[in-house]
Every structure is written in structure tokens, then in C-alpha cells.
């Protein structure tokens, strides 16, 4: 175990042309304060991904209004170091995010506001137990300079903080096989003692009372060979007899999440989904307010006055999760049609429209029936790029500009003469057979081919077609 | 990983055709967020944006405005690839040709992905 | 003739910051996202800040980029001899319908 601590020396406008606005003025004073998020191992990942070694939040720093016409200075500082507490062994290698957030401090509405003004990140090798490293980091125009160091809480120490040290029970030296613990040298480094009866040769421990086994063996004290042959299970073998790995434990298995959180698997370990309230690797962190900035990327914090009500953070566009850690890939829900490109902009999703297409979504046929009117009551119908007109009855044409000759078809079957009626076409039907187009023939019984003539009908009467 | 693979001739005569082939693997030619693109680079002109095809639904292709008259990309989805073909060759087509991937969700336009390049010469 | 203008060299000795000018029009810088491309000598060209200011994973966070109307910039800080290639800014055109790169920047490291 052990802690992280930062120290932020200064955050002001970069060298160059170009100085950035003063984030406050007389009308809106504002102050800063800054939060870091650390990963172990040297991941290139994306901002709001789990800061798995912890995260912390610096106090507030002194309100600060801009001199007008001044230019922006070094900003006021929060006092104090930030510190994040790690419970497990240093990694040695570690990325890290140190964001630089605004509170505005005016009239809003619901409270202060926050925002983002710069963000750094990167990735380094820091050995526990060492020297402050200084170092110095550009967000666009603003520069941030700051050092860390990762110290050992007794009684670990070491690199990697996995040595435990003792007092010495004897003046003069250490135990047999046992060290001095350098630098206390009144010290002496202690044996780690792990879960009574793990194998000496085929398990170890990082933790005091821990058991873990090495590659090829298995069990609660890694008593158990692991025979990688006539196992069916799906995590591996399954019975101990037979020298197969019993299944499990699943990352998730004895869920690791604290305070309601769930878990769930991922390649290389767990994740755990928190309740609003609590964050951390486990859940374990609570009694959140507003006034502890959860809600990251420019996320607002409403409520939460006090560490039992709940705060909610309502996000802005692009990002997700009860704290807004998440960010959405919004373009995979294919908004945009007609072959439009969706371009996430951060603030905006964006269509680029092929040729022909227009619209939010692209989703306006601009060849089609934008700007071109029917005549004579036809409708425009869109489809494929190019606009058609359903003409009214007795026009036709591209636009229904034509005069329609309804018997120019010849509609009339079997004979049956057309004429042409205002409201469409009439056929006259030879004797025996009927219909709209003459189209049924008349049995000679009477009866024709239709389960009924309509009443007041007689066969080989005109009939009108509509 | 994606990787992409080009293969095709490296000398073609004035006047004739040049077919270029970039088979793709870790990724689909048939994937509804990334594009796929024919970029070149010569001494004279730089690099210079050929055209691409994608599939949303369906698949579109897009082309340089200098080339449209002489330019085709047809993707391939039963052998996941696409190529490109070009027309009426002259010793200005000579250059580096890439195939590349824009794939990343939200930003296109990024090619994140780019094929060894074949080198092509234009000559009799 | 591309559309993107850049300066053809810039220089710094390592550890220095050093900042490359892409300057265009409304219809591409203007309009559109922009891109910048690393071309090491000999090798393919490589995707080093995407939509203005994002770095692909596997960039170092020494690079990164931005956008002002028709003008984008990429930075380098802590310059680096690995750094030494040609960069390249690219975006889409409006008015051309595809897209267009820069004329391209040698940057050297002097020793």
C-alpha cells in the first residue's frame, strides 16, 4: 500500500504566440481546481476509462477575477497536495490524466458551474520510495507544471511497496535471510506470510494471508496440478481428482464490487458497475457530493447537498454513465441515410451528405420533388433521385401537363367499345360479357362469372370506369 | 490487427490500365463505419486522394474530381478486398499507390490504416 | 496544386517545441474535421491526430493539434530525433467533393 501524491506548481498560458483568454473576469469570477486519474501500466486509453489505481479531486482554489486588459496570468492555486491512495503494489508504470476544471462562480442558475478548461495526459515509470519528479505539460495554449512521487505507507516499502518491514528484535541484526530495510536501517525487512498451508513451492503471496499459485497449478493452496487434457469445462477442467483445474474463481465470482455495484468480466480482469453515490476500482469510494466535482467531462452535478442525498450528473451530448465517464460512439447508431458520413464532432454529431442529399440526417432528396410542382392536382411522389407526378384522372405526362386520352390504351376487352367520360372512361360492352372492362364473359344459363352482378345491372350494359 | 495488402504491377505501358487489388484483413469491406480509400504520392504532385468506397446499405464510391472520367473502385465482399482501375495512363500517374482505411467511429476521414504501397511506373 | 498550404521545413533541437502551420480555406479547414499524418522516411504515411485533436491510441501525447477558422496547427513538444519525417495535414473539401492534403513539412532535429 501506498500513496500517490501531486503537486501542482503552476497553470497558466504557455510560452508562444497565441496566450489564451482569461478563464474568469470581473462579471463571472471564477476559481480552479484539478482532479487526476491514474491507470496502471502504460495503456494508451481513452480519458474516461476506469482510473483503475484511483483518482482524486484537489480543494478549490482562491476566487480569481480577470484585470481587464491584462493579460491571463498564472491562475491561483488550490493549496495542498493531491493524493491518491493505492492498496495493492506500485506498477512502476502508470498513465495518468490530470484535468484543470473551472467553477464559475456568477448568478446560475442551481448553483456553480464547471467546466473543463485543459486536459493532459501521459504515460511514465516512477519507482516507489524515489525523488519528486518534475514535469511539464501543454493542454493547447495553457501549460501545466507539476511533480509527483509515489511513497510507501508503513510498514511497506521497496520499489513496488510489497516489502513489509519490522523493528528490529535484535540490536545488532536482522533475522537469518532477512534484509535491513534501506533507508530505515533500524528496521528489518519482514517475511510475508501468506494463507496458512499455501504450497511453499507452487503458490506465493503479494498480501499478507493471499495465496496465489503459479502457472500449472491450482486449488485454494495451490496444491492442485493443472492438466490441461479431458477437461470440459467451460473455464477450464473441472474435477481436482483427476488433476483438472476446478472452474473458477471467475473474476466476478464472490462479486468484488462493494455498495451494490455489479461486475462484469472483462479479458484481462473485472469491472464494476457503480450505483450514482460511489466510484472506484471495487465501488468502495463514497459520500460524494457535488461539491467533490464528480461529474467529469463537463458534466453538470445537481443535489447532493450533503454525503446521504444523491447527486445526479446530467451529461452532455457524447457522453454517458452516472459520472459522464463514458463517451458514446454515436456515429455507430448510423444516423445518417443515403450514404451520408457521420462525423462525431464532440459537441455535435454530423452528416456529410452525398450529392443530391440534404438534411440533418441527409435525409432530403433534393432531385426529387423539392421545388417541382404537378399540374392539374397531381402529387409528387419521390424515389431513386428523380421526382414522378401520380397525375389525376385524365392527365398525364412528366408533370400533368397533358391531356390524357383514357381509350388510348384500349381498355375495353372482347370487343367492347371506350368513350371517354369527364370523370374517366366508359366501355360499352359486345353482347355476352360484362364488366368494368368487359373483361367477364356471360354464361349462357344467365349467370355470369361474378359471384353477383351489382343490382339494377343488366348484362351488357355500359359500364363506367372509375 | 487490420492489415491491409496490396498487390498489382509495378510497370505499366502509356495508354493502358492499371488494376490494383488491397485485400483486407481484421475488418470487413462490407463494415458499416469505416471507409476505404486509393491514395498516391509522387515527387510532383504530393499526396493525392484517388477515391473511396463504403457500405452503408449499400455501397457508394466517391472520386477525385481530376480522375472521375477514368477511375473505378469496386469492392469485393466475397474475397473482402476492393481495387482500383485506372484508365488511359500517362507517365503523370506515376507514383506511390496506398490503399487505406478510414475507421475510425465518428471521424472518417482519419485513415488510420495504410497498405505497404506499390510503387507504379508509367513508362513504354 | 493542393488545396492545403503548409511551410515545406521546420526545425528545433531536441526537447525544443516545434509547431507546424496548415492553412486552407471555408470549404475544407474551414468546414471539415482535420487530420495530420507522420511519414517517417521510406515508410507508409501514419495517422498521428485525427478530428482536430485526437491522438489515435499508440501516439504520444507530445503531439497534438489544433484548429482556428481556415487554419489547423500540430505541435510537438520535448521534440524527439524519432521525430524527425514529413507531416502531412489533410481534411475533406466541400467544393471539391474529396479530400486534400497539405504540401507537406520536413521537420529536422538538429543535433
Known amino acids: 500500500a501506498g500513496v500517490f501524491e501531486l503537486q501542482i506548481h503552476s497553470f497558466g498560458p504557455g510560452p508562444g504566440p497565441g496566450a489564451p483568454r482569461s478563464p474568469c473576469s470581473a462579471r463571472l469570477p471564477c476559481r480552479l481546481f484539478f482532479r487526476v486519474c491514474l491507470k496502471p501500466g502504460l495503456s494508451e486509453e481513452a480519458a474516461e476509462s476506469p482510473c483503475a489505481l484511483g483518482a482524486a479531486l484537489s480543494a478549490r482554489g482562491p476566487v480569481y477575477t480577470e484585470q481587464p486588459g491584462a493579460p491571463a496570468p498564472d491562475l491561483p492555486l488550490p493549496d495542498g497536495l493531491l493524493q491518491v491512495p493505492f492498496r495493492d503494489a506500485w506498477p512502476g508504470t502508470f498513465s495518468f490524466i490530470i484535468e484543470t476544471w473551472r467553477e464559475e462562480l456568477g448568478d446560475q442558475i442551481g448553483g456553480p458551474a464547471w467546466s473543463l478548461l485543459a486536459r493532459v495526459a501521459g504515460r511514465r515509470r516512477l519507482a516507489a520510495g524515489g525523488p519528486w519528479a518534475r514535469d511539464i505539460q501543454r493542454a493547447g495554449a495553457w501549460e501545466l507544471r507539476f511533480s509527483y512521487r509515489a511513497r510507501c505507507e508503513p510498514p511497506a516499502v521497496g520499489t513496488a511497496c510489497t516489502r513489509l518491514c519490522r523493528p528490529r528484535s535484535a540490536p545488532s541484526r536482522c533475522g537469518p535471510g532477512l534484509r535491513p530495510c534501506a533507508p530505515l536501517e533500524d528496521e528489518c525487512e519482514a517475511p510475508l506470510v501468506c494463507r496458512a498451508g499455501c504450497s511453499p513451492e507452487h503458490g506465493f503471496c503479494e498480501q499478507p494471508g493471499e495465496c496465489r499459485c503459479l502457472e500449472g497449478w491450482t486449488g485454494p493452496l495451490c496444491t492442485v496440478p493443472v492438466s490441461t487434457s479431458s477437461c470440459l469445462s467451460p473455464r477450464g477442467p473441472s474435477s481436482a481428482t483427476t488433476g483438472c483445474l476446478v472452474p473458477g474463481p471467475g473474476p466476478c465470482d464472490g462479486n468484488p464490487c462493494a455498495n451494490g455495484g455489479s461486475c462484469s468480466e472483462t479479458p484481462r480482469s473485472f469491472e464494476c458497475t457503480c450505483p450514482r453515490g460511489f466510484y472506484g476500482l471495487r465501488c468502495e469510494v463514497s459520500g460524494v457530493t457535488c461539491a467533490d466535482g464528480p461529474c467529469f467531462n463537463g458534466g453538470l452535478c445537481v443535489g447532493g447537498a450533503d454525503p446521504d442525498s444523491a447527486y445526479i450528473c446530467h451529461c452532455p451530448p457524447g457522453f454517458q454513465g452516472s459520472n459522464c465517464e463514458k463517451r458514446v460512439d454515436r456515429c455507430s447508431l448510423q444516423p445518417c441515410r443515403n450514404g451520408g458520413l457521420c462525423l462525431d464532432l464532440g459537441h455535435a454529431l454530423r452528416c456529410r451528405c452525398r450529392a443530391g442529399f440534404a438534411g440533418p440526417r441527409c435525409e432530403h432528396d433534393l432531385d426529387d420533388c423539392a421545388g417541382r410542382a404537378c399540374a392539374n392536382g397531381g402529387t409528387c411522389v419521390e424515389g431513386g433521385g428523380a421526382h414522378r407526378c401520380s397525375c389525376a384522372l385524365g392527365f398525364g405526362g412528366r408533370d400533368c401537363r397533358e391531356r390524357a386520352d383514357p381509350c388510348a390504351a384500349r381498355p375495353c376487352a372482347h370487343g367492347g367499345r371506350c368513350y371517354a367520360h369527364f370523370s374517366g372512361l366508359v366501355c360499352a360492352c359486345a353482347p355476352g360479357y360484362m364488366g368494368a372492362r368487359c373483361e367477364f364473359p356471360v354464361h349462357p344459363d344467365g349467370a355470369s362469372a361474378l359471384p353477383a352482378a351489382p343490382p339494377g345491372l343488366r348484362p351488357g350494359d355500359p359500364q363506367r370506369y372509375l | 490487427q487490420v492489415q491491409l495488402q496490396q498487390s498489382g504491377p509495378g510497370l505499366v505501358k502509356p495508354s493502358q490500365t492499371l488494376s490494383l487489388t488491397c485485400a483486407i484483413s481484421?475488418?470487413?469491406?462490407?463494415?458499416?463505419?469505416?471507409?476505404w480509400n486509393w491514395i498516391r504520392q509522387s515527387p510532383s504532385r504530393g499526396l493525392e486522394w484517388l477515391g473511396w468506397?463504403?457500405?452503408?446499405?449499400?455501397?457508394?464510391?466517391d472520386y477525385a474530381v481530376s480522375l472521375k472520367s477514368r477511375i473505378t473502385i469496386n469492392p469485393d465482399t466475397s474475397k473482402n478486398q476492393f481495387s482500383l482501375q485506372l484508365n488511359s495512363l500517362t507517365p503523370e500517374d506515376t507514383a506511390v499507390y496506398y490503399c487505406?482505411?478510414?475507421?475510425?467511429?465518428?471521424?472518417?476521414?482519419?485513415?488510420?490504416?495504410w497498405g505497404q504501397g506499390t510503387m507504379v511506373t508509367v513508362s513504354s | 496544386q493542393s488545396a492545403l498550404t503548409q511551410p515545406p521545413s521546420a526545425s528545433g533541437t531536441p526537447g525544443q517545441r516545434v509547431t507546424i502551420s496548415c492553412s486552407g480555406s471555408?470549404?475544407?479547414?474551414?468546414?471539415?474535421?482535420i487530420n495530420w499524418y507522420q511519414q517517417l522516411p521510406g515508410t507508409a504515411p501514419k495517422l498521428l491526430i485525427y478530428?482536430?485533436?485526437q491522438r489515435p491510441s499508440g501516439v504520444p501525447d507530445r503531439f497534438s493539434g489544433s484548429k482556428s477558422g481556415t487554419s489547423a496547427s500540430l505541435a510537438i513538444s520535448g521534440l524527439q530525433s524519432e521525430d524527425e519525417a514529413d507531416y502531412y495535414c489533410?481534411?475533406?473539401?466541400?467544393?471539391?467533393?474529396?479530400?486534400?492534403f497539405g504540401t507537406g513539412t520536413k521537420v529536422t532535429v538538429l543535433t
Open positions: 487505406t482505411r478510414g475507421g475510425i467511429v465518428g471521424a472518417p476521414d482519419g485513415f488510420d490504416i
Open positions: 468506397t463504403y457500405y452503408r446499405s449499400k455501397y457508394y464510391n
Open positions: 481484421g475488418d470487413s469491406v462490407s463494415s458499416n463505419s469505416a471507409v
Open positions: 489533410a481534411a475533406w473539401d466541400d467544393s471539391l467533393n474529396g479530400h486534400v
Open positions: 478530428s482536430n485533436n
Open positions: 471555408n470549404s475544407n479547414i474551414g468546414s471539415n474535421p
